[in-house]
Interface confidence: medium
């Protein structure tokens, strides 16, 4: 007599997550009676994951009538894939008794689940950084299925290539994730800049998954300072302007003071925004000269964006403002720092 | 059932145009990658050009000098591709195809004869 | 750009197990390669077999397998059938292309 087989004819059988999977399994011969049972794994840990007799399974359906006479074909679909379905499925032959004994397993399927990887998610550096300074942006995905798959970070559409990638884990898994950091060197000009992650999977039609990042979030501009005056009055006032020019964030506070008196303190609000993202403010402070009998120093002092503050000072010297109307001024600039330093 | 069928094949001079379609039905274009692959007189597979699922990405062969372009209107399950500067060496029988998933020809048309030759 | 080489010609017995192979001028073939099988019949008629190295088209008999040998890609046919006669392309992606392979004609006598 011909020695029962278990015949299961693919190997591997590979699905999209969501769709249902058929696994097939016929035996050669009626003989010996007994039923058949479907397991994930091997050995005494094995999960079982069909039985035709008992046991409630949902998402388990004969794909034909196993309670017809002479049926040999015990294969079986598994609807609704997911990821944690991944694994070697054995159809396994019992003799019947009490208890069954397993009589013969068929070679077994490699069930894989394609899964579509998440939305790229893109986080920046916790504190903003200055031009010249190097920041980093991190891009993670997740749950994508088979392992391979492409990472690719632009700025403003050219590739970068100070990038590191890990998809993890090493090893077979049901699902992988994968986390890349680049490393982005700022400009006074990156304002208006935007990081993308960009991730390419066979699962994804050829129409890659994208996370995005403002380096606006990312960036500070410091402001230049520049303190001028204007020509003297009628009424013997010096109209001192500070310009305040190029920063970013718009987060500024402008404070006036004479001989080291605060003399008006400013917070920037609404301003308009310059092309590439920066803002200008103008602050004008009226000096009455006739007021002073020496020279007057005036500061103008910024802090921008929570930064130690930045000063420029202006001396307005009274002694060449005879008390006259219509004289004209004579000023020195002994200010120092045109812009911040960090 | 699945079925892919090609049209607009035929004889056309050196330098003319050639606008090739693919009628798609038994699946919706929009869920699938779509390639067009040529076969010239007594050779072999030649891979032409893809336009990804939603048909925002397209990769293209760069033997064909951006001569060639493929296009999709998923509203009407049909894949196209415009052929420009045409050459006798572009002589051949012209498949679109079928991606499953990305990386995957499962299904292929029965082809459209383009001619180049005067 | 990359060459894809196959043998030109295999000739097998009804029954018996052929395998044809796949090779990359860049070097060892990969899953990240996805390599095709794709079939070509009299009159034009393709069929796409394997894709993804070893995922078998739903309705292609299991006789055909795909899988890596050594640095190549492989397709086994396991007890070949005379209706398996056919010109066999392999197809490997290369980042951005696909580049096809010369065919294998396969003969079953």
């Known amino acids: 007599e011909e020695e029962l087989q278990v015949i299961q004819p693919e190997k591997s059988v590979s699905v999209a997550a969501g769709d249902s999977a058929t696994l097939n399994c016929t035996v050669s011969s009626l003989i010996p009676v007994g039923p058949i049972q479907w397991f994930r794994g091997a050995g005494p840990g094995r999960e079982l994951i069909y039985n035709l007799k008992e046991g409630h399974f949902p998402r388990v359906t004969p794909v034909s009538d196993p309670t017809k006479r002479n049926n040999m074909d015990f294969s079986i679909r598994i609807s609704n894939i997911t990821p944690a379905d991944a694994g070697t499925y054995y159809c396994v032959k019992f003799r019947k008794g009490s208890p069954d004994v397993e009589l013969k397993s068929g070679a077994g399927t490699e069930l894989s689940v394609r899964a579509k990887p998440s939305a790229p998610v893109v986080s920046g550096p916790a504190v903003r950084a200055t031009a010249e300074h190097t920041v980093s942006f991190t891009c993670e995905s997740h749950g994508f299925s088979p392992r391979d798959i492409t990472l690719k970070w632009f700025k403003n559409g050219n590739e970068l290539s100070d990038v590191q990638t890990n998809v993890d884990p090493a090893g077979k898994s049901v699902s992988y994730s994968i986390r890349s950091t680049a490393r982005v060197v700022l400009t006074r000009r990156d304002v208006h800049s935007q990081v993308i992650c960009e991730v390419a999977h066979v699962t994804l039609q050829g129409d890659p998954l994208r996370g995005t990042a403002n380096l606006s979030e990312a960036i500070r501009v410091p402001p230049f300072l520049e303190v001028t005056q204007q020509s003297m009055r009628a009424d013997n006032q010096v109209n001192v302007t500070c310009q305040v020019t190029k920063f970013y964030p718009q987060r500024l506070q402008l404070t006036w003071l004479e001989n080291g008196n605060v003399s008006r303190t400013e917070m920037a609000s609404a301003l308009p925004e310059n092309k590439d993202g920066t803002y200008n403010w103008t602050s004008w402070l009226l000096v009455n000269v006739s007021a002073h009998r020496d020279d007057v120093k005036l500061t103008c002092q910024v802090e921008h964006d929570g930064q130690p503050a930045v000063n420029k000072s202006f001396s307005v010297k009274v002694s060449a403002h005879p008390k006259e109307q219509g004289s004209n001024t004579a000023a020195e600039n002994t200010g120092t720092n045109e812009r911040n330093i960090y | 059932e699945v079925q892919l069928l090609e049209s607009g094949g035929g004889l056309v001079q050196p330098g003319g145009s050639l606008r090739l379609s693919c009628a798609a039905s038994?699946?919706?274009?929009?869920?699938?990658?779509m390639s067009w692959v040529r076969q010239a007189p007594g050779k072999g597979l030649e891979w032409v050009s893809i336009?990804?699922?939603?048909?925002?990405?397209?990769y293209n062969a760069d033997s064909l000098k951006g001569r060639f372009t493929i296009s999709r209107d998923n509203s009407k399950n049909t894949l196209f591709l415009q052929m420009n500067s045409l050459r006798a060496e572009d002589t051949a029988v012209y498949y679109c195809?079928?991606?499953?998933?990305?990386?995957?020809?499962?299904?292929w048309g029965q082809g459209a004869l383009v001619t180049v030759s005067s | 750009q990359a060459v894809v080489t196959q043998e030109s010609a295999l000739t097998t017995s009804p029954g018996e197990t052929v395998t044809l192979t796949c090779r990359s001028s860049t070097g060892a073939v990969t899953t990240s390669n996805y390599a095709n099988w794709v079939q070509e019949k009299p009159d034009h008629l393709f069929t796409g077999l394997i894709g993804?190295?070893?995922n078998r088209t739903p309705g292609v008999p299991a006789r055909f397998s795909g899988s890596l040998i050594g640095d190549k890609a492989a397709l086994t046919i396991t007890g070949a059938q005379t209706e398996d006669e056919a010109i066999y392309f392999c197809?490997?992606?290369?980042?951005?292309?696909?580049?096809f392979g010369g065919g294998t004609k396969l003969t079953v006598l």
């Open positions: 197809a490997l992606w290369y980042s951005n292309h696909w580049v």
């Open positions: 195809a079928r991606l499953r998933f990305f990386d995957w020809f499962d299904y």
């Open positions: 993804g190295t070893n």
């Open positions: 336009s990804s699922g939603s048909g925002a990405n397209t």
């Open positions: 038994g699946f919706t274009l929009s869920s699938y990658a």
